[in-house]
Each structure stands twice: as structure tokens, then as C-alpha cells.
């Protein structure tokens, strides 16, 4: 048999707090325990769940946990079932609510001397005890002119008068806790002699030179006084108007009219109502002068077909706030469709090429109207007008590769040469239409070129191969004047290139044939042993079939190369003495001699009195000084070659003779004594 060791029992519980209904079972077989609430099985949730055989509540809920709970134990094998005693919760709770007007039916019906009933919508279990407050002060039972029942939630004021005006609130408490009204009620019962607002002036915005009207009315018994004041507290009446309010009129009904409004009229106006009793009622309204600023400029916009784009129009600052609308081709845009206005935005959905053009954002208010245009371009993918083509360009001449495309906006064209971006420089120029000009075609310009034409909508590209048609030219051009050493072997080279390999031959300029000791070997003129007769003018001729022939003239001179007969020697001279550096050279043509001292050429015309160069080439320096020390170079040159030789010059102090030295003792170095 199934036996309940612990059964659930009814208990007090607090809303939102923990609770546990206990249930423990003993049985011979395996039993399955579950719970019923008002006869229906209880499903586990995070808030309410079985814990062992007991039912645990993480937070009791007065709505979901009201009813009768029962623990059921069942042996699934035998089918035997046992049910516990019923158990329920006495749930304690309190919930805040507003203070509402119960009587009369609406605030408008509240009059002095009528009965007013307020109701406190705080509920709870057990039933709460209520406390009423006016302007935060507790109201006690039996207080003059009102009856308050703390058992009930109603507050009755009978009869209601101006002294009952105030902010009414309530609080309530029970065994669960305390709550106060979530929304309070303001009771306003006017004293008939107090000034009451019938019509309050409103802020107005007017354009310059327009008129402005402020309405203001009060009521009271007896009728109240009404007065208008401007910012600086200056009273405005029809009899005494301040200078800056000459065009102000106060009407019998209290309205104030201002005509031809100027900036100085802008400001705060006060309408003051004073009853027989009570404080003055002050109402304020501001007069604003309408204004509208300029609109910021739009950047031109480039959009691609098929996309959705928006252009926001920032309305100019203005008073009143300017209204904004978009126009295209003079027509106001709709608020829906493919091209439409949404708020301040121009929306272009699924852009078409035909949407390109000028759109205008308008802004307007009382002060006037402003407009700003935005230019919308719908980008298209470039199309070819002329693609670059494989080209044969002539060496040394300008060459052109075309990359002509059309698109909106104008496409950007860039060129690549061997995958390297081409810059503009002295040899390459890119025209704005995309044409590439190679100013002076060189052999190595023969390669691949690629142009890319792009817009925001996309790119197209094409490539072309350039073949350079080589000029027929000497490589390198022979020197026009050359020397050969007499009685020696000599060669004069001549080579050329062209579209086809040229043949090269030499001939004498006078047309005579070459002597037998002179051979022409594949463009190299070879002299086995140079004679005086070999001097003269020769012509190298390079020719091929397609390009004809070119000629290079060379004047050959036969010379005896320079040798030194006398070379300068290392020389040491006493300070103040004269130094002689000898140098003599021979050759044909007869060589000229120049001297270089201390790394500069000694100009014979500017040597000064101390230095002199003799006809035979020797250099003499009189009255030598220490700064004359250094390396001196003798340079011998003629039209065929140049040679040089050098020697150092030392300038030393003359030693003072010692006793032991005989008059004939030689100095320790080679010395010139003069």
C-alpha cells in the first residue's frame, strides 16, 4: 500500500517570495509522484517545479498559485494510486494604483460648494488600511469639512472649497507591506474672487513688418484687472505706450495687437490678471521674428545604375522650423514611388540613367524661401570608341596608342607598361581622352601596353603590343676624328643596327680603294702597320634592303705618340732661392706643354713675376716660399694623345752652418743652389 509520510498543508505565503508544499511517500514498489492544481496536472516551470516529491515555489504568484494543490502517488506497475490532503495558500499581497476622481464624473464639473469624492486604487490581501495626504500632509479622521474612512479607500470632501485645493495622495498597508499611490490627483477649486485663466497668450512667430496678436482673458467675481508688460517691465496701455511699442493696441477683451513688427519688438510679453483676492496670475508669451538662414551647398553626386541612394537635405536654421521639399524638373517629388521624398531625404530606388539631372531642395517658412541644387550623375560603364591596337612604331619618332572610351562621368584612363603604371614625363604623355603618346620611341619601348578606363559603375580594359621599327643607325657612331700611332698596328671599328642586319663597308672619301695592307673585316678597318699615307678621310657605309644606307665620315690622323725626353725630378730648394723643374716632350704633331701645380693648371698668361715657363717646357719659380711646396705635373699633349709626369717640390729653411762642418760639406739631399 502507498503511504504518505508527509502531506502538504495549507499555509500563509507572501507574493513573490519562496514557498514549499511538502509531500513524502512510502510504497513497496516504485511510485511516480505528481501534483494537481484544481484537479489539473502541474507542469514544471522555472518559477514552480517539483523538488523530489515536494512542490517548490521560487516566487509565489497570487494569480497562478490560487487554488487547491494535491500530491498524487501512483504505482505504474499495479496501477494503485493515492492522493494527499488538499492544501492551498493564503497569499498576502499589496499593489499600488492611482488616486482617481470618483465624484463628480469629470474635473470640469468640480465647483465650489459641491461634494468631491476621491478613490485610492491600492489593492491587497488582507484588505489594506488606507491613509490620505494633501500636499504631503496626512489627513486625519473627522478633520473639519471632510470625512475620512480608513477602512474604506474613499476620501470625501463635503462641501469642497478653495481651501481643499492641493495634491492628494494615498498610502496603504497590510500584513504584506506598504504601497503608495502611483499617480496623484491635483484638486483645484478656485476662489471666485481669485483671477482665473480663461485664455492664455501663445508664443507667436511673425515675419518682419507683419502684425502679431496676443489673446489674454481672466475671470473672477468681481471682474479682475488685466495688464500687459513688455520685457523691461514697461506697462503697455493705450494711453502710455513706450517708444518702441508705439504700434501696440490693447483691446477691451484683453488682446494685445502689435502692427509692423520690428526686431526690437521681439521678446517676452507678460499678461497679468489680478482678482479682488489672491495672488496675481502672470502669463508669458514670446514674440519671435521669423528668420531663415542660407542652405549649405551640395557636392555633386555620382551614383551607379540599379543601386538605391539617398541625398539628405539639411534644412537651414530657421524660425519657425522651415518645411522642406524636393523638386525635379520643376515638379515636387511624391512621398512614394521609385524616386520620392522621405522626410528630408531624396530617395532614388533602383536608379536609372534617366534619373540623372538637377534636383532642388526647397526650404520655406514665414521669413522666406531658400533652395539648393544637387547635380546627380548616373555613372555608366565605359564603352569603347577606339581600342588600343598592336602597333609598329618607328624608333626616334612620336608614337600613339589610343584608348578612347565614353561614359558618364568622364572616365578615368590609366596606362600600364609591362604591368607598371605609366606616369607623365618627358617621354610619356597621357591625353585627357586617354591617348598615350610616346614622344621619342626607343627600342626598349617594344612591349605590352594596357589601358584601363573606369567610372564608379565599372571598368573596361584592353592591351596592345608595340613593335619598334628600328632606325638604321651606327651603334655607336664612329668618332669623326681618330688618331693612329705611326708604324704600329691599328683598328677602326664601325657597327650598325637596323630592321634587318646591315652590311658594313669602308671606303676612302675620295673613292679610291683601300691599300692591300688595310683590310675591312665585318666593319672593322684594320691597319697592319700604319704609314704616313694612311692618314686621310674614310667613310663607313651601313646598308640594308628596306632602309637604304647611312654613312659616317672619319678623319684619320697618323701621329708619333708622345714620349718625354726630359722628365722633372724630385727637387728640394732653400726658401728664397730659385727652383727649376725641367720637362721636354717629343711627338708628331709637336706636343704642347702645360704645368699643373697644387691641383690647378698654371696659366702662362697669369703666372705673375715669380714663375715662368720656357719654350722648351721647363718651369722656373723664383724666390720660392714654403707654400710653393707640392706636386708639380708636366702635361704634354697634341691632337692625338696626352701624357703626363710629375715630381714633388720641397721648400726648406736654409740651415745655419755649424763649427764642425767644413765649407765644402754637401747637403744631405739633392739641392739646387743659385
Amino acid at each position: 500500500a502507498i503511504v504518505f509520510i508527509k502531506q502538504p498543508s495549507s499555509q500563509d505565503a507572501l507574493q513573490g517570495r519562496r514557498a514549499l508544499l511538502r509531500c513524502e511517500v512510502e510504497a513497496p514498489g516504485l511510485v511516480h509522484v505528481y501534483w494537481l492544481l484544481d484537479g489539473a496536472p502541474v507542469q514544471d516551470t522555472e518559477r514552480r517545479f517539483t523538488q523530489g516529491s515536494s512542490l517548490s515555489f521560487a516566487a509565489v504568484d497570487r494569480l497562478q498559485d490560487s487554488g487547491t494543490f494535491q500530491c498524487v502517488a501512483r504505482d505504474d506497475v499495479t496501477g494503485e494510486e493515492a492522493r494527499s490532503a488538499n492544501a492551498s495558500f493564503n497569499i498576502k499581497w499589496i499593489e499600488a494604483g492611482p488616486v482617481v476622481l470618483k465624484h463628480p464624473a469629470s474635473e470640469a464639473e468640480i465647483q465650489p460648494q459641491t461634494q468631491v469624492t476621491l478613490r485610492c486604487h491600492i489593492d491587497g490581501h488582507p484588505r489594506p488600511t488606507y491613509q490620505w495626504f494633501r500636499d504631503g500632509t496626512p489627513l486625519s479622521d473627522g478633520q473639519s469639512n471632510n470625512t475620512v474612512s480608513s477602512k474604506e479607500r474613499n476620501l470625501t470632501l463635503r462641501p469642497a472649497g478653495p481651501e481643499h485645493s492641493g495634491l492628494y495622495s494615498c498610502c496603504a498597508h497590510n500584513a504584506f507591506g506598504q504601497a503608495c499611490s502611483s499617480q496623484n490627483f491635483t484638486l483645484s477649486i478656485a476662489d471666485e474672487s481669485f483671477a482665473r485663466v480663461v485664455l492664455a497668450p501663445q508664443d507667436v512667430i511673425v515675419a518682419r513688418n507683419e502684425e502679431a496678436m496676443f489673446h489674454c482673458q481672466f475671470s473672477a467675481q468681481p471682474p479682475p484687472n488685466l495688464q500687459w508688460l513688455f520685457e523691461d517691465e514697461t506697462p503697455i496701455t493705450n494711453r502710455s505706450r513706450p517708444p518702441h511699442l508705439r504700434r501696440a493696441t490693447v483691446f477691451a477683451n484683453g488682446s494685445l495687437l502689435l502692427t509692423q513688427v520690428r526686431p526690437r519688438n521681439a521678446g517676452v510679453y507678460r499678461c497679468i490678471g489680478q482678482g479682488q483676492r489672491g495672488p496675481p496670475v502672470i502669463l508669458e508669451a514670446t514674440l519671435h521674428l521669423a528668420e531663415i538662414e542660407d542652405m549649405p551647398l551640395f557636392e555633386p553626386r555620382v551614383f551607379t545604375a540599379g543601386s538605391e541612394e539617398r541625398v539628405t537635405c539639411l534644412p537651414p536654421k530657421g524660425l519657425p522650423e522651415p518645411s522642406v521639399w524636393w523638386e525635379h524638373a520643376g515638379v515636387r517629388l511624391p512621398t512614394h514611388g521609385r524616386v520620392y521624398q522621405k522626410g528630408h531625404e531624396l530617395v532614388l530606388a533602383s536608379i536609372a540613367e534617366s534619373d540623372a539631372g538637377v534636383y532642388t531642395c526647397h526650404a520655406a517658412n514665414l521669413a522666406g524661401q531658400r533652395r539648393q541644387d544637387v547635380n546627380i550623375t548616373v555613372a555608366t560603364v565605359p564603352t569603347w570608341l577606339k581600342k588600343p591596337q598592336d602597333s609598329q612604331l618607328e624608333e626616334g619618332k612620336p608614337g600613339y596608342l589610343h584608348c578612347l572610351t565614353q561614359a558618364t562621368p568622364k572616365p578615368t584612363v590609366v596606362w600600364y607598361r609591362n604591368q607598371m603604371l605609366i606616369s607623365e614625363d618627358s617621354r610619356f604623355e597621357v591625353f585627357k581622352n586617354g591617348t598615350l603618346r610616346i614622344n621619342n620611341v626607343e627600342v626598349y619601348d617594344g612591349t605590352w601596353y594596357r589601358c584601363v578606363s573606369s567610372t564608379p559603375a565599372g571598368s573596361i580594359e584592353a592591351q596592345a603590343r608595340v613593335q619598334v621599327l628600328e632606325k638604321l643607325k651606327f651603334t655607336p657612331p664612329p668618332q669623326p676624328q681618330q688618331c693612329m700611332e705611326f708604324d704600329k698596328e691599328a683598328t677602326v671599328p664601325c657597327s650598325a643596327t637596323g630592321r634587318e642586319k646591315p652590311t658594313i663597308k669602308w671606303e676612302r672619301a675620295d673613292g679610291s680603294s683601300l691599300p692591300e695592307w688595310v683590310t675591312d673585316n665585318a666593319g672593322t678597318l684594320h691597319f697592319a702597320r700604319v704609314t704616313r699615307d694612311d692618314a686621310g678621310n674614310y667613310t663607313c657605309i651601313a646598308s640594308n634592303g628596306p632602309q637604304g644606307q647611312i654613312r659616317a665620315h672619319v678623319q684619320l690622323t697618323v701621329a708619333v705618340f708622345i714620349t718625354f725626353k726630359v722628365e722633372p725630378e724630385r727637387t728640394t730648394v732653400y726658401q728664397g732661392h730659385t727652383a727649376l723643374l725641367q720637362c721636354e716632350a717629343q711627338g708628331d704633331p709637336k706636343p704642347l706643354i702645360q704645368w699643373k701645380g697644387k691641383d690647378r693648371i698654371l696659366d702662362p698668361t697669369k703666372l705673375g713675376p715669380r714663375m715662368h715657363i720656357f719654350q722648351n717646357g721647363s718651369l722656373v719659380i723664383h724666390d720660392v716660399a714654403p707654400e710653393d711646396s707640392g706636386r708639380y705635373t708636366c702635361i704634354a699633349g697634341n691632337s692625338c694623345n696626352i701624357k703626363h709626369t710629375e715630381a714633388p717640390l720641397y721648400v726648406v729653411d736654409k740651415p745655419v752652418p755649424e763649427e764642425s762642418e767644413g765649407p765644402g760639406s754637401p747637403p744631405p739631399y739633392k739641392m739646387i743652389q743659385t
Epitope: T412, V413, S423, E424, V430, K432, V452, S454, S459
Partner: antibody
Framework: QVQLQQSGAELMRPGASVRLSCTAS????????LHWVKQRPDQGLEWIGR????????EYAPNFQGAATMTADTSSNTAYLHLNSLTSGDTAVYYC??????????WGQGTLVTVSA | DIVLTQSPASLAVSLGQRATISCRAS??????????MNWFQQKPGQPPKLLIY???NQGSGVPARFSGSGSGTDFSLNIHPMEEDDTAMYFC?????????FGGGTKLEIK
């Protein structure tokens, strides 16, 4: 060779207008875009705008819209920059330059405009 | 408008050493697979001279010691080894979109 020769220095009174010229040699201005760039004393560079001399199409930086006007005369191969209502803020060197693509490889020598009362 | 921020404003580098100038764009200057960032050198009384175009390509006649790198929004100009003749103002410039804009400039001097 490519050259951009700019007009000489100008000393102007505030409120006056001035027209600067840029004469090209070694190329036809119709084949390129011409740009104008401003440089105030010891300051950075400001792009004023560019003109396509072939059709007179212009683009300006927002700061110069309305304050500067670019024109070109293809018959004399010359571009012009017109500055009106001059103020001290317009005291600067103005350069003209040339592009075929998107990099400025050639510049004029510059024209100094001084605005002083 | 695309704003270019150059740093540092001035730089002193010893002869033979490396000078690096940075330029940051307020938005990407890449388009059509090209970075439209260019570098100019300017000496007193002279117009600017194109050093580097399209971020990393050397202008005509520009010595190999000048090199540029970067893409998107971050770019740099390197000068190595620094020579006496490199004392000048250096400007970055974007030509991705109108208006073309320049960086504030970097004054490069010899330490």
C-alpha cells in the same frame, strides 16, 4: 618641351578683382585638364579647381565656388583664373598645373597676388 | 571632402639616415584597384615637384631613395639615405575625388 608660363605678380586693393593667366607651350591645352592651386605664405596647398579647356567644363572646390572663376582660350593656348572681391585672405601664390590622368606632373612657376590697403 | 592628416609637422634627420613621413586619409582613396595618393616635394620659391604617384610609383627623374607605400587610408613616404638636397617641404595629395585635397605638409631638415 612642356611649359606653363604664368603672368607676373599683382598688388591689389581689398575689394578689387584680378585675372591671372597661364600660357602653355609644348602641348595643346585642349588635350589636357588645367588645374589651379593656391598657396598662402608659409602655408599648405589648396586645390581651387580644374577646367577642361576643350568644352569649358569646370569643377571647383566648395571653398572657392563663387569666389574664383576659371576660363580658357584655346586659340591662345591660355587658361585664366579670375578672383573677385579680394580680401587679405586671398594673398597667396597661385599655381596652374596640367594633368592628363590623376597626377600633376607639370606646374607653372606661380603668380604672387598681394592684397593690401 | 577627404581630409588628409600628415605627420609629423616637422622632422630633422641625419645625413644617410631614413626619413619617414605619414599621411592618413579620412576615408579610403582607393579606386579601380589604384590608390590615388601622390607625394610632392617643394623647395622655397619653387612649385611642387611630383615625387610619387599612385602611392608607390616614382615620378620621372626622381632618385631611387624616394619610395612610397600604403593603401586605403594609411600611406607613407620614405627617404633613405637622406641627402643634403632633400631639405624641403613634403605634401601628400589625394586625387580619388573632387575636390582634390592636400595634407598640411611636413618640413624636413638635416639634423
Amino acid at each position: 618641351q612642356v611649359q606653363l608660363q604664368q603672368s607676373g605678380a599683382e598688388l591689389m586693393r581689398p575689394g578689387a578683382s584680378v585675372r591671372l593667366s597661364c600660357t602653355a607651350s609644348g602641348f595643346d591645352i585642349k588635350d589636357y585638364y588645367l588645374h589651379w592651386v593656391k598657396q598662402r605664405p608659409d602655408q599648405g596647398l589648396e586645390w581651387i579647381g580644374r577646367i577642361d579647356p576643350e568644352d569649358g567644363d569646370t569643377e571647383y572646390a566648395p571653398n572657392f565656388q563663387g569666389a574664383a572663376t576659371m576660363t580658357a582660350d584655346t586659340s591662345s593656348n591660355t587658361a585664366y583664373l579670375h578672383l573677385n572681391s579680394l580680401t587679405s585672405g586671398d594673398t597667396a601664390v597661385y599655381y596652374c598645373s596640367r594633368t592628363g590622368t590623376r597626377w600633376i606632373a607639370y606646374w607653372g612657376q606661380g603668380t604672387l597676388v598681394t592684397v593690401s590697403a | 571632402d577627404i581630409v588628409l592628416t600628415q605627420s609629423p609637422a616637422s622632422l630633422a634627420v641625419s645625413l644617410g639616415q631614413r626619413a619617414t613621413i605619414s599621411c592618413r586619409a579620412s576615408e579610403s582613396v582607393d579606386n579601380y584597384g589604384i590608390s590615388f595618393m601622390n607625394w610632392f616635394q617643394q623647395k622655397p620659391g619653387q612649385p611642387p615637384k611630383l615625387l610619387i604617384y599612385a602611392a608607390s610609383n616614382q615620378g620621372s627623374g626622381v632618385p631611387a631613395r624616394f619610395s612610397g607605400s600604403g593603401s586605403g587610408t594609411d600611406f607613407s613616404l620614405n627617404i633613405h639615405p637622406m641627402e643634403e638636397d632633400d631639405t624641403a617641404m613634403y605634401f601628400c595629395q589625394q586625387s580619388k575625388e573632387v575636390p582634390w585635397t592636400f595634407g598640411g605638409g611636413t618640413k624636413l631638415e638635416i639634423k
